[in-house]
């Protein structure tokens, strides 16, 4: 039975040209995290594997940095980076947990962080 929950940074906004940290946290489970995938729509951004370490997709290697922790840092943001991002936690023995973050990249300097929320 999957008892865990994923807490994410929820809906967030950032300025064009700036950076943002995408962060998810798995709680309420003793399952072992074996891998975390970060994806944007159907595109793989990065993977953090407990044994193999970090892998950054070739398409994003110049703009994505691993961390902090199991999170992901997006740099040199463009308006095209606006959209949904998913953290996919592969765990044993529970299975897979998925969290969703919506990022809006703004032209102006009025970017504010949205509220945190949970996905069961």
């Amino acid at each position: 039975m999957m008892t865990g929950t994923i807490e994410t940074t929820g809906n967030i906004s950032a300025e064009k040209g700036g950076s943002i940290i995408l962060q998810c946290h798995l709680s309420s489970t003793t399952a072992q995290v074996t891998q975390v995938n970060w994806e944007q729509q159907d595109q793989l951004l990065a993977i953090c594997n407990a044994d193999l370490g970090w892998h950054i997709s070739p398409s994003f290697k110049d703009r994505v940095a691993p961390g902090p922790g199991l999170g992901l840092t997006l740099q040199s943001l463009t308006v095209n980076d606006t959209g949904e991002y998913f953290c996919i936690y592969h765990t044993y023995p529970d299975g897979t947990y998925t969290g969703r973050i919506f990022l809006e990249v703004l032209e102006s300097s009025v970017a504010e962080h949205g509220a945190r929320f949970q996905i069961p």
């Epitope: 074996t34 793989l44 993977i47 594997n49 407990a50 044994d51 193999l52 892998h55 070739p58 398409s59």
Partner: antibody
């Protein structure tokens, strides 16, 4: 210099279990590497069998997963491969390999030919 | 599951340039590594990432990638480059895979 040396029976009977070991020198098995087995049937291409990490966790080729076990030997300086229920299709040169991170395979053993035949 | 596809055979005139390609959906998100194998020998790593060469590998070996295709280019092919070449990558589960191999003949 990392050196990998495979050893084991060169002939295994059909339905039996293929058992190979790989002696590792020049690097510690605990040193953040992974250790994998790759095979090559005569005249054919390379096939990844699976690997073991320093944590003891394993990752296997889905097509072989039900028959494969990779482990670290008690002396901790060798890696073992067991492949059960073998058939003639398992006849191949078996290579012990190592690397670190997501890629690539940095070092290969010289390989050992295993023939499955009665 | 993912697959990596290579042309079975390619030939090149001595001193000319040849490109060996590897195609697969997994290469959209992962790098390829390239191995050279001569008859009776274990494979040898010649290129990894996009264009990283291990020490001792001549600079006539280079690489590139575009979308789902990775390429190994040999500029000024030598007789000793005649061999089988295999590409290799991982998928999003960490599983490793190999292409079917390309037999390079130097004429």
């Amino acid at each position: 210099q990392v050196q990998l040396q495979e050893s084991g029976p060169g002939l295994v009977k059909p339905s039996g279990t293929l058992s190979l070991t790989c002696a590792v020198s020049g690097v510690s098995i605990r040193q953040g590497h992974w250790w994998s087995w790759v095979r090559q049937p005569p005249g054919k291409g390379l096939e990844w069998i699976g690997e073991i990490y320093q944590t003891g966790r394993t990752n296997y080729n889905p097509s072989l997963k039900s028959r494969v076990t990779i482990s670290v030997g008690k002396s901790r300086n060798h890696i073992s491969l067991k492949l059960s229920s073998v058939t003639a299709a398992d006849t191949a040169v078996y290579y012990c390999t190592t690397g670190s991170g997501w890629y690539p395979i940095d070092y290969w053993g010289q390989g050992t030919l295993v023939t499955v035949s009665s | 599951s993912y697959e990596l596809t290579q042309d079975p055979a390619v030939s090149v005139a001595l001193g000319q340039t040849v490109r060996i390609t590897c195609q697969g959906d997994s290469l959209r998100g992962f790098y390829a590594s390239w191995y050279q194998q001569k008859p009776g020998q274990a494979p040898l790593l010649v290129l990894y990432g996009v264009k990283d060469r291990p020490s001792g590998i001549p600079d006539r070996f280079s690489g590139s990638r575009s979308g789902t295709t990775a390429s190994l280019t040999i500029t000024g092919a030598q007789a000793e480059d005649e061999a089988d070449y295999y590409c290799n990558s991982r998928d999003s589960n960490g599983a490793m895979m190999f292409g079917g191999g390309t037999k390079l003949t130097v004429l």
